[in-house]
C-alpha cells in the first residue's frame, strides 16, 4: 500500500487497540456540492428496468435508514410499454460501509460493517451462446 | 428519532466531543454471506446501457479505492446491437459514507464524509412533453 507520512499533530493511539480502533468525527462533511439536485430522482420510474425503493431501518446502524431497490419486473419494458421477457431487469448492487453500534445500544462506539445494497436496476441481455 | 436504551458497558464519552467523536473498530464485519458470487459481475457489459468502471484512489480516504461507473454511450443499445438515441443511458448514483483522514496523514483519526458515486447505468425514456 501507500505509506502516509504521519502528521505530528495526530491524536495518540493506544498500542493495544491500534490500528483496529480509531476516532471518527461524525460531523459529516458532504462533498456533493456541485451535483444536479434532480439527479436520479425519477430514473426508477423512467427506466426500461424500473424499480421500487424500500426503506430499511435499523437504529443500531449508522446511517439508520438505507433505501433498497427492488426491480418491478423480471423482464424489461419495451417501446410499446409492455414487459419483454427476452431481456432481464437485474439489480445493480454495491458494497457500502456502515457503522454498527458495538456493543449494542452504545451511542459512541461502533464497528465498521460492509453490506450489499441494491441501488437500482438495469436491463441486460441473457447469456446467449451463438452458433455459427 | 428512535431512542436507544444505553448499554451500561459502553465506553465513556467526553462531553466536549460527544456525540461528535466516536470510537470505531476498523475490523470490518462482512454481512454479505449468502449473496450470489456472480452478482453484477458482467452486467456492465450485457446491459442495454453498458458502462466502464474507473478506479478512483485516494490514500487519505477509507476505503482508499472506489470504482466509478461511466456510461459508454449517450443512447441505449437496441435489439440490433446499435445505439438508439431515442433512449438515454444514465448513471445510477448513490451517496455513500467514507472515512477521511483528519487531520491529514493521521492513521487513527478520521471524519465521516458523504460522497456521490455512480454505481452503474440504466436506460431511461427521455422526458417527452406532449402538446395537446
Amino acid at each position: 500500500g501507500i505509506t502516509i507520512p504521519r502528521n505530528p499533530g495526530c491524536p495518540n493511539s493506544e498500542d493495544k487497540n491500534f490500528p483496529r480502533t480509531v476516532m471518527v468525527n461524525l460531523n459529516i462533511h458532504n462533498r456533493n456540492t456541485n451535483t444536479n439536485p434532480k439527479r436520479s430522482s425519477d430514473y426508477y420510474n423512467r427506466s426500461t428496468s424500473p424499480w421500487n425503493l424500500h426503506r430499511n431501518e435499523d437504529p443500531e446502524r449508522y446511517p439508520s435508514v438505507i433505501w433498497e431497490a427492488k426491480c418491478r419486473h423480471l423482464g424489461c419494458i419495451n417501446a410499446d410499454g409492455n414487459v419483454d421477457y427476452h431481456m432481464n431487469s437485474v439489480p445493480i448492487q454495491q458494497e457500502i460501509l456502515v457503522l454498527r453500534r458495538e456493543p449494542p445500544h452504545c451511542p459512541n462506539s461502533f464497528r465498521l460493517e460492509k453490506i450489499l445494497v441494491s441501488v437500482g436496476c438495469t436491463c441486460v441481455t441473457p447469456i446467449v451462446h451463438h452458433v455459427a | 428519532g428512535i431512542t436507544i436504551p444505553r448499554n451500561p458497558g459502553c465506553p465513556n464519552s467526553e462531553d466536549k466531543n460527544f456525540p461528535r467523536t466516536v470510537m470505531v473498530n476498523l475490523n470490518i464485519h462482512n454481512r454479505n454471506t449468502n449473496t450470489n458470487p456472480k452478482r453484477s459481475s458482467d452486467y456492465y457489459n450485457r446491459s442495454t446501457s453498458p458502462w466502464n468502471l474507473h478506479r478512483n484512489e485516494d490514500p487519505e480516504r477509507y476505503p482508499s479505492v472506489i470504482w466509478e461507473a461511466k456510461c459508454r454511450h449517450l443512447g441505449c443499445i437496441n435489439a440490433d446491437g446499435n445505439v438508439d438515441y431515442h433512449m438515454n443511458s444514465v448513471p445510477i448514483q448513490q451517496e455513500i459514507l467514507v472515512l477521511r483522514r483528519e487531520p491529514p496523514h493521521c492513521p487513527n483519526s478520521f471524519r465521516l464524509e458523504k460522497i456521490l458515486v455512480s454505481v452503474g447505468c440504466t436506460c431511461v425514456t427521455p422526458i417527452v412533453h406532449h402538446v395537446a
Partner: nanobody, 123 residues
Framework: EVQLVESGGGLVQPGGSLRLSCAAS????????MAWYRQAPGNQRELVAA???????EYADSVKGRFTISRDIPENTVYLQMNSLKPEDTAVYYC?????????????????WGQGTQVTVSS
C-alpha cells in the same frame, strides 16, 4: 414450436411436499423466462413462481417461504419444490416458457404452455 412436459403432481396430505418438473424440447438456445402458474376450479390462472436465466425470481405472496423455483438452464428445465402444502394449493399447475432465443441470436415471440399437472392437497 416448443413442447413443455410437466410431471410430479399427485395427491398429498396437508403439510406434505411435492416436486414438479417441466422439461422443454431442446432444439432452442435458451429459454430466458420459465414459470409455474396454477388454476383452481372456478378461478383464473395465477402466477406461482417464475425464474429468468439470470436467476432473478418472482413468487406469489401466498407461496413465499414455502415454494422454491429452480432451473437447469442448459437443459431448459424448471422445477417447483412445494413444501408445507395447504388445501388451498390444490389446483392444476401449468409450466410456462417465453423469452426464447434461437442459436442465431434471434427471438421467438411465442408464449408456450404445458398441458398441466394436477396437485391435490387433502387429508
Amino acid at each position: 414450436e416448443v413442447q413443455l412436459v410437466e410431471s410430479g403432481g399427485g395427491l398429498v396430505q396437508p403439510g406434505g411436499s411435492l416436486r414438479l418438473s417441466c422439461a422443454a424440447s431442446r432444439n432452442i438456445n435458451i429459454i430466458n423466462y420459465m414459470a409455474w402458474y396454477r388454476q383452481a376450479p372456478g378461478n383464473q390462472r395465477e402466477l406461482v413462481a417464475a425464474m429468468t436465466s439470470d436467476a432473478t425470481t418472482e413468487y406469489a405472496d401466498s407461496v413465499k417461504g414455502r415454494f422454491t423455483i429452480s432451473r437447469d438452464i442448459p437443459e431448459n428445465t424448471v422445477y417447483l419444490q412445494m413444501n408445507s402444502l395447504k388445501p388451498e394449493d390444490t389446483a392444476v399447475y401449468y409450466c410456462n416458457a417465453k423469452g426464447i432465443w434461437d442459436y442465431l441470436g434471434r427471438r421467438d415471440f411465442g408464449d408456450y404452455w404445458g398441458q398441466g399437472t394436477q396437485v391435490t392437497v387433502s387429508s
